[in-house]
């Protein structure tokens, strides 16, 4: 029943062009190129995409034409390597072009930059955007794909097509509205926030595949799909996992045409077989392709079947446990994970994976014994502390969030994480701690049964951002250790870190705490980031500062900004009051 077993095609590029259609083909090639060559100007990419598209059309007309039999990696890699400024713009990435496939593609993948040195995207005035949209809709939408793809080199390409479709719909509707801004801006904000979340979620999938291997990704997928489709048989879930793994392996590997094509096939298969998968798919399956795939990926968990038997019978009490384990270890562990996950939509995926790992470790030890059952009889008791740890952590942090509100909760996390890993760059600490803090408003509103899957799986996504950013410029052994030892134990590893006693406090630099009148014109969010940046720097200067000391300094700082932003001569106020504030803060913190 494999969805993806196709006849061999004489021309892969023709095959994908025909399957996807010209519009999607061009969009996906543009995304692929922008994700590889993140610094290239838009016009250069459009030119390359047009050349590839024209070539693909010749292959559609005659699959035996010259070069049409070449692999997509060969065709795309050859095209990328024609860029004249490759050496000047990308430095050693140009060396990739001296390699043969598949090494050349691997080389390009290794040079993808999670934090490219690109200017922040500034949103023009609504009228300016609407004019650009009306003047050349195609270019406007291509520009969107290009700008997102180059800043998010692991963005899930078929999902980016869905975002672009919504982006287009927003402009089509709102540029005709009476109040264009009121219509458009909330939609753009929503797309931006959803886009960042989507990018981060996909980045974790790619990290899982690339750093921990296919087995790790498949385990994650078994757990998640079993929670989502608890009525589906194990064989059905296994088939979906195999196909989903292929889709994500392709996208994470830069094979975006194959990925999009296979994702469409998977959506088709799921909808054709929804009776044996989930009762919640009906609405999704009535939608057009891009919406359908997105909807399936986000679909709510189906109801659990009634009267599921106890897990202990097959996995603890049965005399055949070790026999079944020996016969097919991964299948047996997969069945354990499936059975546990479908019964526990209230657990995070990472918790389910920790339980499965504990079960595996126990079987490895106990099945070597003369009396295995005596050894593993109490294995489920070992699960209790593993379940209670995230439950308690979430309870404590939700209480703190409810007490402080999002901004102050983020500040508490900023202090906590700066003390744990003070070597990490300030922008990274601010970005990651702000995102960690968003778990409060995202998850604490949920009832108990939904809190853990929401919170802990979200934290896994955010901590992966820390891991990929840190990997680019490693500065902390503790971060490296937590990021590389175990994918499912990253969060507990970071939670367990105490204050880094080996850290030598940063030298005090008054310039870091010098502010100007421009802070008054910033949005509330930007102003918060400025203040949080100062907070991280304070902790780096004085890691032993108490909560009370830091709170006092931050309150003074907030009052100082408010006062100077109301002053007639703002700049003079910032200069004079700023000096006083720095002096007072130094005294308060004993700097």
């Amino acid at each position: 029943r494999g969805v993806f077993r196709r006849d061999a095609h004489k021309s892969e590029v023709a095959h994908r062009f025909k399957d996807l259609g010209e519009e999607n083909f061009k969009a996906l090639v543009l995304i692929a190129f922008a994700q590889y060559l993140q610094q290239c100007p838009f016009e250069d990419h459009v030119k390359l995409v047009n050349e590839v598209t024209e070539f693909a059309k010749t292959c559609v007309a005659d699959e035996s034409a010259e070069n049409c039999d070449k692999s997509l990696h060969t065709l795309f890699g050859d095209k990328l390597c024609t860029v004249a400024t490759l050496r000047e713009t990308y430095g050693e990435m140009a060396d990739c072009c001296a390699k043969q496939e598949p090494e050349r593609n691997e080389c390009f993948l290794q040079h993808k930059d999670d934090n490219p040195n690109l200017p922040r995207l500034v949103r023009p005035e609504v009228d300016v955007m609407c004019t650009a949209f009306h003047d050349n809709e195609e270019t406007f939408l291509k520009k969107y794909l290009y700008e997102i793809a180059r800043r998010h080199p692991y963005f899930y390409a078929p999902e980016l097509l869905f975002f672009a479709k919504r982006y287009k719909a927003a402009f089509t509707e709102c540029c005709q509205a009476a109040d264009k801004a009121a219509c458009l801006l909330p939609k753009l904000d929503e797309l931006r926030d959803e886009g960042k979340a989507s990018s981060a979620k996909q980045r974790l999938k790619c990290a899982s595949l690339q750093k921990f291997g296919e087995r790790a990704f498949k385990a994650w997928a078994v757990a998640r799909l079993s929670q989502r489709f608890p009525k589906a048989e194990f064989a059905e879930v296994s088939k979906l996992v195999t196909d989903l793994t292929k889709v994500h392996t392709e996208c994470c590997h830069g094979d975006l045409l194959e990925c999009a094509d296979d994702r469409a096939d998977l959506a088709k298969y799921i909808c054709e077989n929804q009776d044996s998968i989930s009762s919640k798919l009906k609405e999704c399956c009535e939608k057009p392709l891009l919406e359908k795939s997105h909807c399936i990926a986000e679909v709510e968990n189906d109801e659990m079947p009634a009267d599921l038997p106890s897990l202990a019978a097959d996995f603890v009490e049965s005399k055949d446990v070790c026999k079944n384990y020996a016969e097919a270890k991964d299948v047996f562990l997969g069945m354990f994970l499936y059975e546990y996950a479908r019964r526990h939509p209230d657990y995070s995926v990472v918790l389910l994976l920790r339980l499965a790992k504990t079960y595996e470790t126990t079987l490895e030890k106990c099945c070597a014994a003369a009396d295995p059952h005596e050894c593993y009889a109490k294995v489920f008791d070992e699960f209790k502390p593993l379940v209670e740890e995230p439950q308690n952590l979430i309870k404590q942090n939700c209480e703190l969030f409810e007490q402080l509100g999002e901004y102050k909760f983020q500040n508490a996390l900023l202090v906590r994480y700066t003390k744990k890993v003070p070597q990490v760059s300030t922008p990274t600490l601010v970005e990651v701690s702000r995102n960690l803090g968003k778990v409060g408003s995202k998850c604490c509103k949920h009832p108990e049964a939904k809190r853990m899957p929401c919170a802990e799986d979200y934290l896994s996504v955010v901590l992966n951002q820390l891991c990929v950013l840190h990997e680019k410029t490693p500065v902390s052994d503790r971060v490296t250790k937590c990021c590389t030892e175990s994918l499912v134990n990253r969060r507990p590893c970071f939670s367990a870190l105490e204050v880094d006693e080996t850290y030598v406090p940063k030298e005090f630099n008054a310039e870091t705490f010098t502010f100007h009148a421009d802070i008054c014109t910033l949005s509330e969010k930007e102003r918060q980031i400025k203040k949080q940046t100062a907070l991280v720097e304070l902790v780096k200067h004085k890691p032993k500062a108490t909560k009370e000391q830091l709170k006092a300094v931050m309150d003074d700082f907030a009052a100082f900004v408010e006062k100077c932003c109301k002053a007639d001569d703002k700049e003079t106020c910032f200069a004079e009051e700023g000096k006083k504030l720095v002096a007072a803060s130094q005294a308060a913190l004993g700097l």
Partner: nanobody
Framework: QVQLVESGGGLVQPGGSLRLSCAAS????????MSWVRQAPGKGPEWVSA????????RYSDSVKGRFAISRDNAKKTLYLQMNSLKPEDTAAYYC????????GSQGTQVTVSS
Amino acid sequence: QVQLVESGGGLVQPGGSLRLSCAASGFTFGSFGMSWVRQAPGKGPEWVSAIDSGGGDTRYSDSVKGRFAISRDNAKKTLYLQMNSLKPEDTAAYYCTIGRSTSRGSQGTQVTVSS
């Protein structure tokens, strides 16, 4: 594909001896405890003896304690059962299993104790 192939059974007089072997393949033999199980005609399976993966810990049912000795050679992926002082009530099909399973995954080898 897990395969367990027993051999060494036969007809023996009461008080006699036999050595059964079980050749294993298709799994990491040296990582698993193993058992011998027997099934007499018309009866359910009966666990006889077990050994841990390293061969250091052996267990026996009361009915064979002091007469049977289980052992293994991990290099050869083979399990053994040395049966001494055999009695008519030891007559059964003997098969080896992984862990303490009593599920029959092989043909087994027939042991008949009769004068």
